[in-house]
């Protein structure tokens, strides 16, 4: 599947997942905490203040680095999966903290966590996610 299609599919799935998670957690616009979001790279579930959310590296990096081996499982497509099975010490895991001021920036930043190789990816722009 073309990466652009994967992207659109993942974004749509993310919005559905967030909606389901909001219902499960009883989240609404006035709830304290951090709303679920699609950050143009991957999907983040809603979280309570003080909660750290972990995600596996998104499909985007598997396209860039097909030989990259991550020690973590991919979060399930039907829901957000069990992020307890992920560990920040693993390669391929990104975290955000939910604070009183909202989401922190990703840690580590995606390129560091997911093994982005700018030289390996110089070619093949047709497989690049154009996020519009």
């Amino acid at each position: 599947m073309h990466s652009d299609c994967i992207f659109k599919k993942e974004q749509a799935m993310c919005l559905e997942k967030i909606q389901r998670a909001n219902e499960l957690m009883g989240f609404n616009d006035s709830s304290p905490g951090c709303p679920g979001m699609w950050d143009n790279i991957t999907c983040w579930k809603p979280a309570h203040v003080g909660e750290m959310v972990l995600v596996s590296c998104p499909e985007l990096f598997r396209i860039f680095n097909p030989d990259q081996v991550w020690e973590t499982e991919t979060i399930g497509e039907s829901d957000f999966g069990d992020s307890n099975s992920l560990d920040l010490s693993d390669m391929g895991v990104v975290s955000r903290n939910c604070t009183e001021d909202g989401w922190s920036e990703p840690f580590p930043h995606y390129f560091d966590a997911c093994g982005f190789d700018e030289y390996e990816s110089e070619t093949g722009d047709q497989d690049y996610y154009y996020l519009s």
């Epitope: 950050d39 143009n40 790279i41 903290n97 604070t99 001021d101 922190s104 920036e105 990703p106 840690f107 580590p108 930043h109 995606y110 390129f111 560091d112 700018e118 990816s121 110089e122 690049y128 154009y130 996020l131 519009s132």
Partner: antibody
């Protein structure tokens, strides 16, 4: 090798506008976030703004929010900083820097800077 | 916004001595704290990322430690080319911020 060359600096009167440019080469510009960081004469570094690789996300320091606009043209490998309502305290050497990430990242490569002097 | 405080403002040492620079954040930044070196008339150079991760091309005498709110940059044995200004930078929360810098000068 990564190269960033800033231009557009100069002397401008308070209240006027100026647009800075940063020409990038030696890397796939369209895949990286980009930052502007400034340094007033004899002072420390001040983070100004960042733009995500596709221009979809832009963030600013409080001191410039509403006055400065960061933008990019990936087809020209160029980063911009539109500065309006300039003040004396905006006088600084403005650096563009590559952010090591799609979204924001930390600056890993820097240009040599372009000097902006706001004076009547 | 997160305020970064660096101490001391100036550190006067001789070549061969050990330099210990401190950076303190007003709230936790986890490990998203990076160190830069700037020499007069030059652009800053990234030295250490994520508090303690070394970078290729950076001499092994530079090391970093810390997490949360307290961080340290250590230069194990100062070389003449190490006399410069050092800045910490947090990329944990927007707006990003830099510390005011520590100047390491020759005693």
């Amino acid at each position: 090798q990564v190269q960033l060359v800033e231009s557009g600096g100069g002397v401008v009167q308070p209240g006027r506008s100026l647009r800075l440019s940063c020409a990038a080469s030696g890397f796939t510009f369209s895949r990286f976030a980009m930052h502007w960081v400034r340094q007033a004469p004899g002072k420390g570094l001040e983070w100004v703004a960042v733009i995500s690789y596709d221009g979809g996300n832009k963030y600013y320091a409080r001191s410039v929010k509403g006055r400065f606009t960061i933008s990019r043209d990936n087809s020209k490998n160029t980063l911009y900083l539109q500065m309006n309502s300039l003040r004396a305290e905006d006088t600084a050497l403005f650096y563009c820097a590559r952010g090591y990430d799609f979204l924001t990242g930390y600056p890993d490569y820097w240009g040599q800077g372009t000097l902006v002097t706001v004076s009547s | 916004e997160i305020v970064l405080t660096q101490s001391p403002a100036t550190l006067s040492l001789s070549p061969g001595e050990r330099a210990t620079l401190s950076c303190r954040a007003s709230q936790s930044v986890g490990r998203s704290l990076h160190w830069y070196q700037q020499k007069p008339g030059q652009a800053p150079r990234l030295l250490i990322k994520y508090a303690s991760q070394s970078l290729s091309g950076i001499p092994a005498r530079f090391s970093g430690s810390g997490s949360g709110t307290d961080f340290t940059l250590t230069i194990s044995s100062l070389e003449p080319e190490d006399f410069a200004v050092y800045y910490c930078h947090q990329s944990s929360r927007l707006p990003f911020t830099f510390g005011p810098g520590t100047k390491v000068d020759i005693k």
